[in-house]
């Protein structure tokens, strides 16, 4: 988890002087509780936005937006703590809005936004906005949380972001797999425009089961520049096992931008349909 660019982050708006600060996610009001604390945020919204860095890279970011409740507690509102927790790693990143002037009621509801948390493809986050100071131990909670799942790199809009392109999202191998005679598979795919090697991973399964009955790895050397975007054809020999008929072919590229952590593409060949042929009736009936 990180913030997009460390340029001056702004939270000031007409009628409010505000500064954005790094936070340890442990606000001082936890340790030194206050008697009077503000109410919780209202209408917390998390949206996926896309933002360019100063270098021109495009990243997915969490756009966080919330409003204040229209009660007198805004007189005691000193700021807000924004927390983003990545659920699969428990990594947390926080920033603090520090209000440098007192809030006053005005003709429209106070609204705040922040769009600088960079999020990763196919990751889920819990976003929390805590009004500050935080409540006393038995006080009513004054935070709001929402979960938010970022689409993976196959999503049309995500595909063109820098993290996805770095993992090979623009490469479409257009894999075709056909079954040949003599227990062979013919795999064909389009090479990318990089002189890097590939690996074909074949895993075979019985018709209705998910434990493999055959595994094979095939190495494809780096293509020459004149072979870029051309089709590569590989014939794989299968083990002659009856019923080991469902084949998953996975192609792993080793692009320089992602090395051994590039996006893999796969195709599956199903078992052939069994014809519903009736039992043959014998020409004569045995008499015993």
């Amino acid at each position: 988890l990180r913030l997009l660019d460390h340029r001056a982050l702004v939270c000031s708006q007409p009628g409010l002087n505000c500064t954005v600060k790094n936070s340890t996610c442990l606000d001082d009001s936890w340790i030194h509780p206050r008697n009077l604390t503000p109410s919780s945020p209202k209408d917390l919204q998390i949206q996926l936005h896309f933002a360019h860095t100063q270098q021109g890279d495009l990243f997915p970011v969490a756009h966080i937006e919330w409003t204040l409740q229209t009660d007198a507690s805004i007189l005691y509102l000193e700021g807000a703590e924004l927390s983003v927790l990545q659920l699969n790693t428990n990594e947390r990143l926080c920033v603090r809005f520090e209000f440098l002037s007192k809030l006053r009621h005005h003709h429209r509801r106070w609204r705040f936004t922040f769009s600088h948390f960079v999020v990763d493809p196919d990751q889920e986050y819990e976003v929390t906005v805590h009004h500050l100071p935080k409540p006393i131990p038995d006080g009513d909670p004054n935070h709001q949380s929402k979960n938010f799942l970022v689409p993976d790199c196959e999503h049309a809009r995500m595909k063109v972001t820098t993290p996805c392109m770095s993992s090979g999202s623009l490469w479409d191998p257009n894999i075709t797999v056909e079954t040949l005679e003599a227990h062979q598979l013919r795999v064909s795919f389009t090479l990318w425009n990089e002189s890097t090697h590939y690996q074909i991973l074949l895993t075979s399964f019985p018709h209705m089961e998910n434990h493999s009955c055959f595994e094979h790895m095939h190495h494809i050397p780096a293509p020459r520049p004149e072979e870029f975007h051309q089709r590569s054809n590989v014939t794989l020999t299968l083990r002659n096992l009856k019923g080991c008929c469902r084949h998953q072919v996975q192609i792993q590229p080793f692009f320089s931008s992602c090395l051994n952590d590039c996006l893999r593409h796969s195709a599956t060949v199903s078992c052939p349909e069994m014809p519903d042929t009736p039992e043959p009736i014998p020409d004569y009936m045995p008499l015993w």
Partner: nanobody, 127 residues
């Protein structure tokens, strides 16, 4: 014009099944997560189920888990809700909704994350 049109509701006996459909138009359907939300007579809105843009993840309210299945067909711009073992408490107006953002907010705290709603289809479970 951005539009969601639900169909498939009706009167059904307890224990029976029903399949709701939602036809989407006017936006890039396979960019967005979609949800089903219901409103029982005289009650508030209740989130029922949600599905990510590619069907990679589905979530359900505890009250329908194991009985309802959400699915989508991006080629047909359609969202579905297969309902089995229907109960009288499933009687409601069922709405198909589109998520405002490209991300996915799964769960019952998400009803304010939707920007487009259908007109609803009524499901009545009664003997």
């Amino acid at each position: 014009e951005v539009q969601l049109v639900e169909s498939g509701g009706g009167l059904v006996q307890p224990g029976r099944s029903l399949r709701l459909s939602c036809a989407a138009s006017g936006f890039t359907f396979d960019d967005y997560a979609m949800h089903w939300v219901r409103q029982a007579p005289g009650k508030g809105l209740e989130w029922v189920s949600g599905i990510t843009w590619n069907g990679g993840r589905m979530d359900y309210a505890d009250s329908v888990k194991g009985r309802f299945t959400i699915s989508r067909d991006n080629a047909k711009n359609s969202l579905y809700l297969q309902m089995h073992s229907l109960r009288t408490e499933d009687t409601a107006l069922y709405y198909c909704t589109k998520e405002r953002s490209l991300g996915y907010c799964g769960g019952d705290s998400c009803s304010d994350a939707f920007d487009i709603w259908g007109q609803g289809t009524m499901v009545t479970v009664s003997s």
